[in-house]
């Protein structure tokens, strides 16, 4: 759809790459203040099909620092707290949006990259392959 | 921690908000290339926290359209296929990050906005709160 | 080329049912959103329904919903709807469309995002005739 | 609303510029992009404008659009026998979840 007029104090975008390569400021604005930190900070936990954090850190990507979760079972815990093999524990995994420096180890030139990260586990019900 | 030496082909860093405004590459590199794109396509389904994807659209925010997960029910699926309310769907959040148009309107400048989404339900035990 | 063609139009009876498909090439399917619209004769362009990129997500006009379902199926880049209880005001040329490259949280996916975008391919419409 | 708010009807010569009007409300046109349709008659309706006034390639450059607050146009400048047609704005609905279409507006070249 149609956006409102550009705004005449736009940067200039006479690059040969434009759209394609554009100015962003790093000052990261938060839009969710009024959340709780500790939103689901104890799901992976109390989850049928609970999970654990893993520190991946690279200092190539902004942000350097990404926690990965790894579902704790195959299958997902029961009303008797014990693992039922019949469900299946999964990761619900998201493509994110990460900057990586683009030349290598310079501090002002990024490239956008989509990276795989696993957020948490669901459980689900397998999908069963019946052999003729 | 030190970082490599920095690359001495780095484009110019003159500019008087640096290193808090970049040049960003929006050309979208994927480092995913080996996965299956079926991969989780559907466990909102097969869930026994399932969930339905919701359309959110926004032209200020790159990327416009993102498609969020709520889940079904406040309770989770068992295994006759009903709803048990003794145990809670809740949504996995995260914090990702999306690129805001900053002055408003304008094409190529950006500024780096941290969002939450709902990527997916799992199913969690309940806190009880006993009454004295 | 970019090209969508629908099928499975035809005269039908009041509380019926049929099923239209839209066969997609020339682009990669399973990125982007596709939608359902339709045009009753003599009248303008009445928006039915949009499916998100992994078919996770689902949105429909109050006209339809609880009669309508549209799916996909990425694997034979193919688009549905499948129209149940048809009413005489359900007669007119439907059009599936292709919407936005967009973001899903909850699933991976493989394209960059629309810069722009908007409903920039259309199927040439097959005819839905409702009546006894 | 259920539908945007487009005149019936336009017209004008080859040496004038003809706008038609695309009206909303905060839940559409307000917060979401406005894209712009072309449907000659007897075919599939074709984009004409996109997100950021964009042109799909082959649109001719005498099409442009605008928008400010609730509302959007569409201008045709010097319009052609050829542009002779339907035109319809649609938009992102966020209280509907889903898209709203304006009535469409009949465009004759004089």
């Known amino acids: 759809g149609i956006t409102i007029p550009r705004n005449p104090g736009c940067p200039n975008s006479e690059d040969k790459n434009f759209p394609r390569t554009v100015m962003v400021n790093l000052n990261i604005h938060n839009r969710n203040t009024n959340t709780n930190p500790k939103r689901s900070s104890d799901y992976y936990n109390r989850s049928t099909s609970p999970w654990n954090l893993h520190r991946n850190e690279d200092p190539e990507r902004y942000p350097s620092v990404i926690w990965e979760a790894k579902c704790r079972h195959l299958g997902c815990i029961n009303a008797d707290g014990n693992v039922d093999y019949h469900m299946n524990s999964v990761p619900i995994q998201q493509e994110i949006l990460v900057l990586r420096r683009e030349p290598p180890h310079c501090p002002n030139s990024f490239r956008l990259e989509k990276i795989l990260v696993s957020v948490g586990c669901t459980c689900v019900t397998p999908i069963v392959h019946h052999v003729a | 921690g030190i970082t490599i030496p920095r690359n001495p082909g780095c484009p110019n860093s003159e500019d008087k908000n640096f290193p808090r405004t970049v040049m960003v590459n929006l050309n979208i590199h994927n480092r995913n290339t080996n996965t299956n794109p079926k991969r989780s396509s559907d466990y909102y389904n097969r869930s026994t926290s399932p969930w339905n994807l919701h359309r959110n659209e926004d032209p200020e925010r790159y990327p416009s359209v993102i498609w969020e997960a709520k889940c079904r029910h406040l309770g989770c699926i068992n295994a006759d296929g009903n709803v048990d309310y003794h145990m809670n769907s809740v949504p996995i959040q995260q914090e990702i990050l999306v690129l805001r148009r900053e002055p408003p309107h304008c094409p190529n400048s950006f500024r780096l906005e941290k969002i939450l989404v709902s990527v997916g339900c799992t199913c969690v035990t309940p806190i009880v709160h006993h009454v004295a | 080329e970019v090209q969508l063609l629908e099928s499975g139009g035809g005269l039908v009876q009041p509380g019926g049912s049929l099923r239209l498909s839209c066969a997609a090439s020339?682009?990669?399917?399973?990125?982007?959103?596709m939608l359902w619209v339709r045009q009753a004769p003599g009248k303008g362009l009445e928006w039915v329904s949009v499916i998100s990129p992994s078919g996770g997500g689902t949105h429909y006009a109050d006209s339809v919903k609880g009669r309508f379902t549209i799916s996909r199926d990425n694997s034979k880049n193919t688009l549905y709807l499948q129209m149940n209880s048809l009413r005489a005001e359900d007669t007119a040329v439907y059009y599936c469309?292709?919407?936005?490259?967009?973001?899903?949280?909850?699933?991976?996916?493989?394209?960059?995002?629309?810069?722009?975008?908007?409903?920039?391919?259309w199927g040439q419409g097959t005819t839905v005739t409702v009546s006894s | 609303q259920s539908e945007l708010t487009q005149p019936p009807s336009v017209s004008g010569a080859p040496g004038q510029r003809v706008t038609i009007s695309c009206s909303g409300d905060t839940s559409n046109v307000g917060k979401n992009a406005v894209s712009w349709y072309q449907q000659l008659p007897g075919t599939a309706p074709k984009l004409l404008i996109d997100?950021?006034?964009q042109r799909p390639s082959g649109v001719p450059d005498r099409f442009s659009g605008s928008k400010s607050g609730t509302s959007a146009s569409l201008a045709i400048s010097g319009p052609q026998s050829e542009d002779e047609a339907d035109y319809y704005c649609?938009?992102?609905?966020?209280?509907?979840?889903?898209?709203?279409f304006g009535g469409g507006t009949k465009l004759t070249v004089l």
């Open positions: 469309a292709r919407g936005s490259e967009s973001f899903e949280v909850s699933s991976s996916w493989y394209g960059g995002w629309d810069y722009y975008y908007g409903m920039d391919v």
């Open positions: 997100s950021n006034n």
């Open positions: 649609a938009a992102w609905d966020d209280s509907l979840s889903g898209v709203v």
């Open positions: 020339g682009f990669t399917f399973s990125h982007y959103e």
